[in-house]
């Protein structure tokens, strides 16, 4: 499934814009803010009432090659006694990010941007109850 | 850059790392085909650590619009629907990659940018510091 094209002309095209072949765009993969650090509260994945584990997926043909995915540890949530309460639900929270994929076709190489959905963590929710007539 | 396995039959001139600048097809592929139907957009209200969503728009960025979470309470919602301050609502943050127009306003020239977004909130047991 494809989404609409990125990068059609808008404003007045400045003269300083680099020339780009039709049907493609120039992408500098030197990341802005590469060294910023996440200042998330300490080990919230273990302290949460909807705890989660992390898995690192690694793909040498993807940039960045490492993408970290979270998985909820339980179906229910952890109560004050440290027991799983199945009257509540642990659910994944997801966020979209972009990656660059390198594709080999014979000896030629092409690059494709992809939207990827990352599971970031989990939250505890009250379930939706469906009443059957 | 990162190391890329090469077809051994190909000429050796190709750099095995990702180059600094690449030409990318204008179509962005959506790997999230048939996104999880269980994925709900009302978790922000049903969570024991509910959050509000704030709209952030920047036309020089792709995606231009990002909705960011801000926890509604310091504490968490208990079974009675009240805020329990013995627990804490904390944001779940994630670094994501977006595209930044560079130079600005250029239609087909971008640079990857890492930004930190708050995606939602989760309820945690607080860290208690005992003062001697």
């Amino acid at each position: 499934r494809k989404i609409p094209k990125v990068g059609h002309t808008f404003f007045q095209k400045p003269e300083s814009c680099p020339p780009v072949p039709g049907g493609s765009m120039k992408l500098d993969i030197g990341i802005i803010n590469e060294n910023q650090r996440v200042s998330m509260s300490r080990n919230i994945e273990s302290r949460s009432t909807s705890p989660w584990n992390y898995t690192v997926t690694w793909d040498p043909n993807r940039y960045p090659s490492e993408v970290v995915q979270a998985q909820c540890r339980n179906l229910g949530c952890i109560n004050a006694q440290g027991k799983e309460d199945i009257s509540m639900n642990s659910v994944p929270i997801q966020q979209e990010t972009l990656v660059v994929r390198r594709k080999h076709q014979g000896c030629s190489v092409s690059f494709q941007l992809e939207k990827v959905l990352v599971t970031v963590g989990c939250t505890c929710v009250t379930p939706v109850i469906h009443h059957v007539q | 850059g990162i190391t890329i396995p090469r077809n051994p039959g190909c000429p050796n001139s190709e750099d095995k790392n990702f180059p600094r600048t690449v030409m990318v097809n204008l179509n962005i592929h959506n790997r999230n085909t048939n996104t999880n139907p269980k994925r709900s957009s009302d978790y922000y209200n049903r969570s024991t650590s509910p959050w509000n969503l704030h709209r952030n728009e920047d036309p020089e960025r792709y995606p231009s619009v990002i909705w960011e979470a801000k926890c509604r309470h310091l504490g968490c919602i208990n079974a009675d629907g009240n805020v329990d301050y013995h627990m804490n609502s904390v944001p779940i943050q994630q670094e994501i990659l977006v595209l930044r127009r560079e130079p600005p306003h250029c239609p087909n020239s971008f640079r990857l940018e890492k930004i930190l977004v708050s995606v939602g909130c989760t309820c945690v047991t607080p860290i208690v510091h005992h003062v001697a």
């Epitope: 808008f10 | 969503l53 036309p59």
Partner: antibody, heavy 121, light 106 residues
Framework: EVQLVQSGAEVKKPGSSVKVSCKAS????????IHWVRQAPGQGLEWIGV????????FYNQKFDGRATLTADKSTSTAYMELSSLRSEDTAVYYC??????????????WGQGTTVTVSS | EIVLTQSPDFQSVTPKEKVTITCSAS?????IYWFQQKPDQSPKRWIY???ELASGVPSRFSGSGSGTDYTLTINSLEAEDAATYYC?????????FGQGTKLEIK
């Protein structure tokens, strides 16, 4: 073909509520926000607010905050606008329009056909 | 709230004439959008991001401007251009529209 099909005309009493639907087809519903705009008889256009079907996020023109509620159902690709505590000044044509989240300079590109809401005692 | 003031409110024009509609913003905005609306129809996106013509819009239309002053120009008016044109800003909340300019063909 992109289409935004809105529900039919409504006649309401002052103080009551109205809920207008907007069914989207021909595109990926969650790639676009849904904005709502109204037009009183013989008047100009007035922005009510926005709903993001993907995240569930909403943002309102302060004038309508507390009275308007924007929601969406991803399973049916339908957006809704509910307006409560209706008064005669709310008599207008209500439009839904889509807005691409990824490249916002396109603006509001497709519009629904409009729903006439008449508030009269 | 950014107020958009269009000028003129109403204009009666002869075919083939050049028409200029201006939109003045009470504060600086990054770009403007123009919509065309005909009686009993929904608005149509006409010009986006100040300069870009929406698909299907004849090339006799053009958009320009920056800061607080923006213009929609029709180089050689045709009968089908009779409509009300609205400018729109989304640089600041709440998003606002101009009061509209009604073009009538003489």
């Amino acid at each position: 073909e992109v289409q935004l099909v809105q529900s039919g005309a409504e006649v309401k009493k002052p103080g009551s509520s109205v809920k207008v639907s907007c069914k989207a087809s021909g595109y990926t519903f969650t790639d676009y926000e849904i904005h709502w705009v109204r037009q009183a008889p013989g008047q100009g256009l007035e922005w009510i607010g926005v709903n993001d079907p993907e995240s569930g996020g909403t943002f309102y023109n302060q004038k309508f905050d507390g009275r308007a509620t924007l929601t969406a159902d991803k399973s049916t690709s339908t957006a809704y606008m509910e307006l409560s505590s209706l008064r005669s000044e709310d008599t207008a044509v209500y439009y839904c329009t889509r807005y691409y989240r990824y490249e916002s300079f396109y603006g509001m590109d497709y519009w629904g056909q409009g729903t006439t809401v008449t508030v009269s005692s | 709230e950014i107020v958009l003031t269009q000028s003129p409110d109403f204009q009666s024009v002869t075919p083939k004439e050049k028409v200029t509609i201006t939109c003045s913003a009470s504060s600086s905005i990054s770009y403007i959008y123009w919509f065309q609306q005909k009686p009993d129809q929904s608005p149509k996106r006409w010009i986006y991001a100040t300069f870009e013509l929406a698909s299907g819009v004849p090339s006799r239309f053009s958009g320009s401007g920056s800061g607080t002053d923006y213009t929609l120009t029709i180089n050689s008016l045709e009968a089908e251009d009779a409509a009300t044109y609205y400018c729109h800003q989304r640089s600041s909340y709440p998003w606002t529209f101009g009061q509209g300019t009604k073009l009538e063909i003489k």
